[in-house]
């Protein structure tokens, strides 16, 4: 066997994208590698070129169609192969039977906006992007708020165990700058994981009225 360790991990965004990461200890950075996707019940097949993302890690996106098109279903199986060029031939490095709806990672939520802000609370809404209609309401969210003097890692996680695309943050400090992020996860899928965090939304609470208790 090839020396060292390797890992091949892919996720489906529930619509028309399979994102893959392949890593192998000791592989050369300029190695030319691809991911090939062969569905068991579709007429198409797809290839993407793995591009380096770190010292021994490569990534690529299999674009299956228009961003909001439903290209795969719960019954689909896609055989994914990593192939790397060795001289004049391609060598198979890894193969995975991929069940798209068992390996979900949605796109980060988008369109975060402040609906209403007061001295001690703020109502924020967002939208999910490129999420399959198959989920109906079977989604959950995690949110976090960055307070002054803290890091994102220190921020407590707020869990929304239902498809609720808004949150009312309470017990905030008046006239204070905050940032807010949210991520989403379908309830379906053995290997399903959280989406990336959304772009942070910056907001500021209103100052306390002069001469009043705060």
């Amino acid at each position: 066997a090839v020396n060292g360790t390797s890992q091949f991990t892919c996720f489906y965004n529930s619509r028309a994208n399979i994102s893959c990461v392949w890593s192998q200890d000791g592989a050369l950075q300029d190695t030319s590698c691809q991911v090939h996707a062969w569905p068991d019940r579709r007429r198409w097949n797809q290839t993407c070129e793995l591009l380096p993302v770190s010292q021994a890690s490569w990534a690529c996106n299999l674009i299956l169609g228009a961003p909001d098109s439903q290209k795969l279903t719960t019954v689909d199986i896609v055989t994914l192969r990593v192939l790397c060029r060795e001289g004049v031939r391609w060598r198979v490095m890894a193969i995975q039977d991929f069940k798209p709806f068992e390996n979900l990672r949605l796109m980060a939520p988008i369109s975060l906006q402040v609906v209403h802000v007061e001295t001690h609370r703020c109502n924020i809404s967002w939208e999910i992007s490129q999420a399959s209609h198959y989920f109906e309401r079977h989604l959950e969210f995690e949110a976090r708020t960055l307070s002054p003097g803290h890091t994102w890692e220190e921020a407590p996680l707020l869990t929304l165990k239902q498809k609720q695309e808004w949150i009312c943050l309470e017990t905030l400090t008046p006239d204070t700058q905050y940032e807010f992020q949210v991520r989403v996860k379908p309830l379906q899928g053995e290997f399903t994981t959280w989406s990336p965090w959304s772009q942070p939304l910056a907001f500021r609470t209103k100052p306390a009225a002069l001469g009043k208790d705060t």
């Epitope: 390797s6 068991d40 055989t79």
Partner: nanobody
């Protein structure tokens, strides 16, 4: 508990055939690719063959292609390696392994204890 148990190894003559098997616990067998590796004395562990769990897609090392056939019996949670036209250089301890992927690196998640195959010239 995850268990992979190999069987069927033995001593054969060059040119003979042998079938080795691997029995796996049900959860592993139905959710993981299965494969065979081998290690000859003083040599590194070498990928031999692998088979995926849903489509039974197979992959072979160049050294055994056309001579060895990997298969799986889903009803019995068992994988087989049919080895034909055996050569002395096939002599090794053969290990059964399971992982989410077929990988040519020897870092699969689960391993058996091995079964010895010896090919005499």
């Amino acid at each position: 508990e995850v268990q992979l148990v190999e069987s069927g190894g033995g001593l054969v003559q060059a040119g003979d055939s042998l079938r080795i098997s691997c029995a796996a616990s049900g959860r592993i067998f139905s959710n993981y690719a299965m494969g065979w590796f081998r290690q000859a004395p003083g040599k590194e562990t070498e990928f031999v063959a692998g088979i995926t769990h849903l489509t039974s897609t197979t992959h072979y090392a160049d050294s055994v292609k056309g001579r060895f056939t990997i298969s799986r019996d889903n009803a019995k949670n068992t994988m087989h390696l049919q080895m034909n036209n055996l050569k002395p250089e096939d002599t090794a301890l053969y290990y059964c392994a399971a992982d989410r992927n077929i990988k040519i690196t020897a870092d699969w998640s689960y391993w058996g204890q091995g079964t010895q195959v010896t090919v005499a010239s």
